[in-house]
């Protein structure tokens, strides 16, 4: 039975040209995390594998940095980066947990962080 929950940074905003950290945290489970995938819609941004370490997808390696922790840093943001981001935790024996973050990239300096929320 899957007992874990994923806490994410929720709905967040950031300025064009700036950077943002996407963070998820898996709690309430003793399952072993074997790999975390970071995806934007159906595009893979990066993975962090327990054995193999980090690997950034070729098309994002100039603008994506691993960490902190299992999080992901997006740099040189453009308005095209606005959208949904998913952290997908592959765990054993539980299976897959998915967290969602919505990022809005703003032209002006009114970027503010939204509230955290949980996805069971």
């Amino acid at each position: 039975m899957m007992t874990g929950t994923i806490e994410t940074t929720g709905n967040i905003s950031a300025e064009k040209g700036g950077s943002i950290i996407l963070q998820c945290h898996l709690s309430s489970t003793t399952a072993q995390v074997t790999q975390v995938n970071w995806e934007q819609q159906d595009q893979l941004l990066a993975i962090c594998n327990a054995d193999l370490g980090w690997h950034i997808s070729p098309s994002f390696k100039d603008r994506v940095a691993p960490g902190p922790g299992l999080g992901l840093t997006l740099q040189s943001l453009t308005v095209n980066d606005t959208g949904e981001y998913f952290c997908i935790y592959h765990t054993y024996p539980d299976g897959t947990y998915t967290g969602r973050i919505f990022l809005e990239v703003l032209e002006s300096s009114v970027a503010e962080h939204g509230a955290r929320f949980q996805i069971p």
Epitope: N49, D51, L52, H55, H90, Y92, G95, T96
Partner: antibody, heavy 119, light 106 residues
Framework: EVQLQQSGPELVKPGASVKMSCKAS????????MDWVKQSRGASFEWIGR????????SYNQKFKGKATLTVDKSSSTAYMELNSLTSEDSAVYYC????????????WGAGTTVTVSS | QIVLTQSPAIMSASPGEKVTMTCSAS?????MHWYQQKSGTSPKRWIY???KLASGVPTRFSGSGSGTSYSLTISSMEAEDAASYFC?????????FGAGTKLELK
């Protein structure tokens, strides 16, 4: 053209070791993972392990821990697999394959290296 | 580790016939991938992420499924489709293949 060029067939004696190579060309070697897969005669496939060429870190199928060792030479875009303490059970075709990062499938395969263990 | 059972093990089809082969997983998996292999050659990625066709694969092929049940379908069999087809999955602690379905031309 994206290619994985594997070393030639090997005939080895029981108890010996063998090291085979897989040279990548036509793509940036460090942008992908490299995997090794065993196909026994007339049988299906067994995944042996995966290598991250950026840092040399590896992930193995539990069954092949202690049997296979995966290494890399980034400068020549070449992955290697060494098999030790060979027995007749190790006679097979061994493929290197380019591994997808997230979904763990194999989009490019080498031609395979045939290993025959016989006294 | 997750066991993949392919059925049938061997099948034959006439040109123009619809072909369906299945891959059953012992536990739920998120994605299934399929490879085509012809005798004496290395496998080719055929269908990935359950339903996406690899580059160069004819559109008569399709893949579907979810959970523990997946399938590969050929809408109209052609001679060049005679080959062995293997399913493959990765879950958190294992990467496994099915034993294959050998498709012959009738």
């Amino acid at each position: 053209e994206v290619q994985l060029q594997q070393s030639g067939p090997e005939l080895v004696k029981p108890g010996a070791s063998v090291k085979m190579s897989c040279k990548a060309s036509g793509f940036t070697f460090t942008d992908y993972f490299m995997d090794w897969v065993k196909q026994s005669r007339g049988a299906s496939f067994e995944w042996i392990g995966r290598l991250n060429p950026n840092n040399g870190r590896t992930s193995y199928n539990q069954k092949f821990k202690g049997k296979a060792t995966l290494t890399v030479d980034k400068s020549s875009s070449t992955a290697y697999m060494e098999l030790n303490s060979l027995t007749s059970e190790d006679s097979a075709v061994y493929y290197c394959a380019r591994g997808d990062l997230g979904r763990w499938y194999f989009d490019v395969w080498g031609a395979g290296t045939t290993v025959t263990v016989s006294s | 580790q997750i066991v993949l059972t392919q059925s049938p093990a061997i099948m034959s089809a006439s040109p123009g016939e619809k072909v369906t082969m299945t891959c059953s997983a012992s536990s739920s998996v998120s994605y299934m991938h399929w490879y085509q292999q012809k005798s004496g050659t290395s496998p080719k990625r055929w269908i990935y992420d359950t339903s996406k066709l690899a580059s160069g694969v004819p559109t008569r092929f399709s893949g579907s499924g979810s959970g523990t049940s997946y399938s590969l379908t050929i809408s109209s069999m052609e001679a060049e489709d005679a080959a062995s087809y293997f399913c493959q999955q990765w879950s958190s602690n294992s990467l496994t293949f099915g034993a294959g379905t050998k498709l012959e031309l009738k």
